[in-house]
C-alpha cells in the first residue's frame, strides 16, 4: 500500500482539491483510499505529460536535448515496475489483504497447507459449527468469559444428534445454561427459558448446568470444569 | 538525429504509458475483487467460511463428521464388530482410524469409550498393519507385542489400546484425509 505513496513523492503531484481525507471505514478503507490514489495518479500523470508536451513544443525549435522525453520514459518505467510489483504481490499472495482482517481475531493462527480456514486451527468442526475443546478447567463464569474472548459462546446444545456427539467426545463440561437461584428458571446465556431436563435441579446451590454422560445436570457455578466454546456458522 | 532520438523516446514513453495503463487497470480489477471479497466476509469469527464450504469439497467434512486439523472423523455412537465397522467406513469412502500420532484425537481426550481402529495382524508380514498396508509405528503402542494376533485393536483417546475379539461390538472411528 505504501508504494502509491512513493509515486506521489516522486511525481511531486499537487494535492487534489476534489479528494477529501476519508476516515477509515472498518477494514476496507485502505483499499478504498488506494483506489482513489491510483485514479488520482493516473489523472495527474496525464496532466503532467501534457505539460511536458507543451514545454517540448515550445522548446523544440531551439534544439535542446530531449530531457522531457527521457524524464517521462524514466518516470513511466519506474511506475511500470512499481505497478508490476503490486500486481505480482496481489496475484501471488492473495492472503495479504485478508491477513490484517484475520489478525484482529484473538486466535491468531498459522496457516497450514491443508487448513482451509473454516475454523481456527485446533478447533473442530461439526454440523455447521466450530468448537473449541478446552483442556483446562475453569469456573462457569471464567468459562463464559474465556469463550467470549474467543469470539464465541459457551457450549449450547441444539438437538439430540449434537448431544450424542458431545457426550461421546467430552462427557463432562460446562454449558451456557444457568439460573439466578433455585427459585428462578433455567435460562440460556441469550436469556431464553431453557426447557430441557436438568438433573439435580432441586439442589439450591447448583445454579449452573453441565453436560455429563447421561444428559445435563446442575452443579455449583464455582466448581472448576473443562469448558468448550461453540461458534455457529 | 535529434528528431529521431526524440521520436524514439516518445515511442518508448508511449509504450511504457500503455503498459502502465494496462497494469493500472489490472491492479484496479484485482483490488476491486479483493475489496468485494472482504466486504462480503463478516468481521473475522472462528466460524468456517461458508463460501469456502460451498466452493471446495476438499475443505469440508460431511454432516455428522468431525473436522479436526486436516482430517474428517466419524465418531460412532452405536457399536459394531470390527468387520462391520470396517465395511461401514468403506461405504463412506473412508477407512477405520489410522493413527498418525498419539495426540491425534486429543480433541476427545476426556472420552471414556474404546473405539475400533484400522489395525489388524498380517500373518503374511508377521506384523500389525494399518488398512493401507503400512506398518504400526512402535512408539504408538509400546504394549503392542502383547496383542494377540487373532484379535482386533480398540483404542481410546487417552492413548490406551487393547486387543479384543474382533466379534466384540465396539464403537468405531472412520477417518478421511482432506488432502
Amino acid at each position: 500500500m505504501d508504494n502509491q505513496g512513493v509515486i506521489y513523492s516522486d511525481l511531486n503531484l499537487p494535492p487534489n482539491p476534489k479528494r477529501k481525507q476519508q476516515k477509515p471505514k472498518g477494514n476496507t478503507s485502505s483499499i478504498l483510499v488506494t483506489e482513489q490514489e491510483i485514479t488520482y495518479v493516473e489523472l495527474n500523470l496525464q496532466k503532467t505529460s501534457q505539460d511536458f508536451q507543451g514545454n517540448y513544443k515550445t522548446n523544440h525549435c531551439k534544439d535542446l536535448p530531449s530531457v522531457p522525453e527521457k524524464l517521462i520514459a524514466g518516470i513511466l518505467g519506474i511506475i511500470c515496475l512499481i505497478l508490476m510489483a503490486s500486481v505480482v504481490t496481489i496475484v501471488v499472495i492473495p492472503s495479504t489483504l485478508t491477513q490484517k482482517h484475520n489478525n484482529s481475531s484473538l486466535n491468531t493462527r498459522t496457516q497450514k497447507a491443508c487448513h482451509c480456514g473454516h475454523c481456527p486451527e485446533e478447533w473442530i468442526t461439526y454440523s455447521n459449527s466450530c468448537y473449541y475443546i478446552g483442556k483446562e478447567k475453569r469456573t462457569w463464569a471464567e468459562s463464559l468469559l474465556a469463550c467470549t474472548l474467543k469470539n464465541s459462546s459457551l457450549l449450547s446444545i441444539d438437538n439430540e444428534e449434537e448431544m450424542k456427539f458431545l457426550t461421546a467426545i467430552s462427557p463432562s463440561t460446562w454449558t451456557g445454561v444457568f439460573r439466578d437461584s433455585s427459585q428462578h428458571p433455567w435460562v440460556t446465556i441469550n436469556g431464553l427459558t431453557f426447557k430441557h431436563e436438568i438433573k439435580d435441579s432441586d439442589n439450591a446451590e447448583h445454579n449452573c448446568a453441565m453436560l455429563h454422560a447421561r444428559g445435563l445436570k446442575s452443579d455449583r457455578c464455582g466448581s472448576s470444569k473443562i469448558y468448550h466454546c461453540k461458534h455457529k456458522l | 538525429m535529434a528528431v529521431f532520438k526524440t521520436t524514439l523516446w516518445r515511442l518508448i514513453s508511449g509504450t511504457l504509458g500503455i503498459i502502465c495503463l494496462s497494469l493500472m487497470a489490472t491492479l484496479g480489477i484485482l483490488l476491486k475483487n479483493s475489496f468485494t471479497k472482504l466486504s462480503v466476509e463478516p468481521a473475522y469469527t472462528p466460524g468456517p467460511n461458508i463460501e469456502l464450504q460451498k466452493d471446495s469439497d476438499c475443505c469440508s467434512c460431511h454432516e455428522k463428521w468431525v473436522g479436526y486439523r486436516c482430517n474428517c472423523y466419524f465418531i460412532s455412537s452405536e457399536e459394531k464388530t470390527w468387520n462391520e465397522s470396517r465395511h461401514f467406513c468403506a461405504s463412506q469412502k473412508s477407512s477405520l482410524l489410522q493413527l498418525q500420532n498419539r495426540d491425534e484425537l486429543d480433541f476427545m481426550s476426556s472420552s471414556q469409550h474404546f473405539y475400533w481402529i484400522g489395525l489388524s495382524y498380517s500373518e503374511e508380514h508377521t506384523a500389525w498393519l494399518w488398512e493401507n498396508g503400512s506398518a504400526l509405528s512402535q512408539y504408538l503402542f509400546p504394549s503392542f507385542e502383547t496383542f494377540k494376533p487373532k484379535n482386533c485393536i480398540a483404542y481410546n483417546s487417552k492413548g490406551n489400546a487393547l486387543d479384543e475379539s474382533c466379534e466384540t461390538k465396539n464403537r468405531y472411528i472412520c477417518k478421511q484425509q482432506l488432502i
Epitope: 438437538n159 439430540e160 433455585s182 428458571p185 433455567w186 431453557f194 430441557h196 435441579s201 432441586d202 445435563l216 | -
Partner: antibody
C-alpha cells in the same frame, strides 16, 4: 426431590366451576411444561392439555377446548386447571404431570397423586 | 387424533415370567412413545421414554422396543411389585393420546 402435590377431592354442583391446583416442589415449573390428564374407569386416560408456565402458551385436546382453562402462578410454583359448566361427565380423577422434555425425547416422568372431582346435585 | 391400540387388556402371569405388552399407533410415531405404570390406588410413574430409554430409577428388567407404528414393553423375570396397570402414551402430535391399558395380575 421432584413432587407434584394435588388436593385430594372436590365435590361440586352441576353447572358450577372448579379450580384444581398442582403445586410443584424440587423444580421450577417455568422450566418445563405442565400437563393435565383425566381418568374415568370406563374411558381410560384422556389428555386435556398442557401449559408452558414461562409464557402462558397452551395446547388443548379439541374435546376440552372451552371446557378447561390452564393457568399457572410462578411465584407459588403452582399450575391450575379450571373446569367450567360441570356435568356428571366431568366426574373423574384429574392428574397433573410434568413433561419430560429432553432433546427429541419427551414423556411423563412425574405425576401428581390426582384429584377426584365429583359432580353431584 | 392418533389412536393407540394396546393389547392385551389384561394378563395373568407368574412371578419370574417374561411378559410383553404391545401398542399399535394408527400412524407412524417415530419412537415418540412412553410407557407408564399405575399401581392400585396410586398415581402414575414413568417407565420408558422415547420408545427405548429407561427413566431414572427404573429397574433394567423393563425394556422398550419398536419402530414405526408398533411398540412393545417387555418385563423380564417379573417381581411382585410389577403387578400393576401399564399404559402407553404417544406424543408425536397433539393431542397426546393413551392406550387403553393392560392389567397385569398374578396367576
Amino acid at each position: 426431590e421432584v413432587q407434584l402435590q394435588q388436593s385430594v377431592a372436590e365435590l361440586v354442583r352441576p353447572g358450577a366451576s372448579v379450580k384444581l391446583s398442582c403445586t410443584a416442589s424440587g423444580f421450577n415449573i417455568q422450566n418445563t411444561y405442565m400437563h393435565w390428564v383425566k381418568e374415568r374407569p370406563e374411558q381410560g386416560l384422556e389428555w386435556i392439555g398442557r401449559i408452558d408456565p414461562a409464557n402462558g402458551d397452551t395446547e388443548f385436546a379439541p374435546k376440552f377446548q372451552g371446557k378447561a382453562t390452564l393457568t399457572t402462578d410462578t411465584s407459588s410454583n403452582t399450575a391450575y386447571l379450571q373446569l367450567s359448566s360441570l356435568t356428571s361427565e366431568d366426574t373423574a380423577i384429574y392428574y397433573c404431570g410434568r413433561e419430560r422434555y429432553f432433546y427429541g425425547s419427551r414423556g411423563f416422568a412425574y405425576w401428581g397423586q390426582g384429584t377426584l372431582v365429583t359432580v353431584s346435585a | 387424533d392418533i389412536l393407540m391400540t394396546q393389547s392385551p387388556p389384561s394378563m395373568s402371569v407368574s412371578l419370574g415370567d417374561t411378559v410383553s405388552i404391545t401398542c399399535h399407533a394408527s400412524q407412524g410415531i417415530s419412537s415418540n412413545i412412553g410407557w407408564l405404570q399405575q399401581k392400585p390406588g396410586k398415581s402414575f410413574k414413568g417407565l420408558i421414554y422415547h420408545g427405548t430409554n429407561l427413566e431414572d430409577g427404573v429397574p433394567s428388567r423393563f425394556s422398550g422396543s419398536g419402530s414405526g407404528a408398533d411398540y412393545s414393553l417387555t418385563i423380564s423375570s417379573l417381581e411382585s411389585e410389577d403387578f400393576a396397570d401399564y399404559y402407553c402414551v404417544q406424543y408425536a402430535q397433539f393431542p397426546w393420546t393413551f392406550g387403553g391399558g393392560t392389567k397385569l395380575e398374578i396367576k
